[in-house]
């Protein structure tokens, strides 16, 4: 956990963060693990420590090895290890597996490819992006902040994407490249205006006084994972938590049930020991997502217990 693999290419900048995180006020000391020799903090050195960051400007194959960082608080010292490997630049276009960052997946609706590790560097936009070593051109490709957006993603967009940027340190510029694979999901998810399956609009629910009653608010929001989707109950236009009646509580039912591939949510309203005054309330089932909000209203009515005597009179 506190040993982290980092890699880079010779003659490029490489910045490594201590895998042992601490508060910003804590000091961090860096050492060569093999020799226990302290790494300097002076920026004139090619390899130097800067707080929780270890900087190779630029990196050399001989820098490969394990580095120790010790994070010091007033009362605790905690150790982390950075396993650094610097590789020679490849002459051909192939990016070997050991230089690849984690694979990301995209779909028609979400096709962002983040440039790995870029948050560690002092860089300025725009990023340059390459696919299989070819510079990306055309209106479908947009370099935005630290990621690439591909419009109208197709299965042919799968492949290895390399981002290239310049790190600036005290006026000196250093090149950095990072590559990751991009795969395209076949199944296209989508989002719809919420559809409330239950209760029906203006439904009248029969309840017995003194008994418990359950109302289920069930809605579907589209297909696949939804970024924002919620169902909830309101009483007389007020959230359940704010209404202040401990007998009436809501709890999540089935979370994101993918029956027929649809993303649906349930919220169950539990009314304990139904009272006369509960019949006067307006119960609203609300379903909302990025498209908007849909509301179905329910009212309660008294269910008269069967009077067995009157049947035989």
């Amino acid at each position: 956990k506190f040993s982290k693999q980092s890699w880079g290419l010779e003659n490029e900048a490489l910045i490594v963060r201590c895998p042992r995180q601490g508060k910003p006020s804590y000091t961090v000391d860096w050492y060569y693990s093999q020799t226990n020799k302290s790494i300097p903090t002076q920026e004139r050195n090619r390899v130097f420590a800067s707080g929780q960051l270890l900087k190779f400007l630029p990196a050399a194959v001989a820098d490969s090895g394990i580095y120790t960082c010790i994070v010091r608080s007033p009362t605790f010292n905690r150790t982390g290890y950075a396993n650094v490997t610097i590789y020679k630049k490849q002459s051909d276009c192939n990016v070997p597996d050991y230089l690849m960052y984690s694979t990301v997946s995209g779909s028609e609706k979400n096709s962002k490819i983040y440039c790995p590790t870029i948050d560690l560097y002092n860089w300025t936009a725009p990023l340059e992006w390459f696919k299989n070593c070819q510079a990306l051109q055309g209106s479908r490709y947009r370099a935005h902040k630290s990621f690439l957006v591909i419009d109208n993603v197709m299965t042919e967009d799968a492949g290895d994407y390399t981002c290239k940027f310049i790190h600036n340190e005290n006026g000196a510029n250093y090149s950095v490249t990072a590559t990751r694979s991009f795969t395209v999901k076949d199944e296209q998810g989508f989002s719809l205006f919420p559809v409330i399956g239950a209760p029906a609009q203006n439904e009248i629910k029969e309840v017995e006084i003194g008994k418990n009653a359950n109302l289920t608010c069930s809605a579907c929001f589209g297909k696949g994972t939804q970024f924002l989707a919620a169902v909830l109950w309101q009483l007389n236009g007020t959230k359940i938590t704010d209404f202040g009646e401990p007998r009436i509580q809501q709890e999540e039912g089935q979370n994101q049930s993918f029956s027929n591939g649809l993303a649906c949510l349930d919220m169950v309203l539990r009314i304990a020991d139904v009272k006369e005054e509960d019949l006067l309330l307006q119960y609203d089932c609300l379903a909302l997502n990025l498209h908007g909000l849909r509301r179905h209203t329910v009212r309660l009515s008294r269910k008269n217990p069967i009077d067995h005597h009157s049947i035989y009179c």
């Epitope: 956990k1 506190f2 601490g22 508060k23 009362t75 605790f76």
Partner: antibody
Framework: EVQLLESGGGLVQPGGSLRLSCAAS????????MFWVRQAPGKGLEWVSS????????YYADSVKGRFTISRDNSKNTLYLQMNSLRAEDTAVYYC????????????????WGQGTLVTVSS | EIVLTQSPATLSLSPGERATLSCRAS??????LAWYQQKPGQAPRLLIY???NRATGIPARFSGSGSGTDFTLTISSLEPEDFAVYYC?????????FGQGTKVEIK
């Protein structure tokens, strides 16, 4: 010197409520995560709840989820535990403790503890 | 939830003897393990953090070792004030959990 002082314990009936407080001093309260840990009579230690320094994230043991609420007032250097729907099995000494290191979403050890306050749930 | 199992439940030793307490995790906790000492009527006291580092003010006779799932707390030579209950705690993830404790008593 770091000090944590719990208060608010006592005898309460099942289904009742109590609010525990923990007054902190001797350190920068607002930057450290704080914990509630309990110990039933003659038993071991059980983590109850924790809250990050800015109050932005809270965590609960399954046994108290939905019944207990942890909160903090950094302007008063005070940690709270609101306990509702109390059960007999909640009977314990409740300790407040400091996590001196934790970063967002992670935990560390508890280096300072209060003396504890006894909560007894009984009819 | 990660379960920590301490053994033995009770350790009967004399002052000056060596105490070896064990803590086993149901899955790897790397080195995210601490040891605490608790005396009757008192709050727990932190002894060891990150499996092997002594907390500030803890005597050198206390040492911790181990990584992954198996951990040991060693008291090299028991002093009278060391007779207490010892707990291990993991903090690799939520929920943090404690072992059930080992009582070190005077033989």
């Amino acid at each position: 010197e770091v000090q944590l002082l719990e208060s608010g314990g006592g005898l309460v009936q099942p289904g009742g409520s109590l609010r525990l407080s923990c007054a902190a001093s001797g350190f920068t309260f607002s930057v450290d995560s704080m914990f509630w840990v309990r110990q039933a009579p003659g038993k071991g230690l059980e983590w109850v709840s924790s809250i990050e320094g800015n109050g932005g994230a809270t965590y609960y043991a399954d046994s108290v989820k939905g019944r207990f609420t942890i909160s903090r007032d950094n302007s008063k250097n005070t940690l709270y535990l609101q306990m509702n729907s109390l059960r007999a099995e909640d009977t314990a000494v409740y300790y407040c403790a400091r996590d001196p290191w934790s970063t967002e979403g992670s935990f560390f050890v508890l280096d300072y503890w209060g003396q504890g306050t006894l909560v007894t749930v009984s009819s | 939830e990660i379960v920590l199992t301490q053994s033995p439940a009770t350790l009967s030793l004399s002052p000056g003897e060596r105490a070896t307490l064990s803590c086993r995790a149901s899955q790897s906790v790397d080195d995210d393990l601490a040891w605490y000492q608790q005396k009757p009527g008192q709050a727990p006291r932190l002894l060891i953090y990150d499996a092997s580092n002594r907390a500030t003010g803890i005597p050198a006779r206390f040492s911790g070792s181990g990584s992954g799932t198996d951990f040991t707390l060693t008291i090299s030579s028991l002093e009278p004030e060391d007779f207490a209950v010892y707990y291990c705690q993991q903090y690799i993830g939520a929920p943090i959990t404690f072992g059930q404790g080992t009582k070190v008593e005077i033989k």
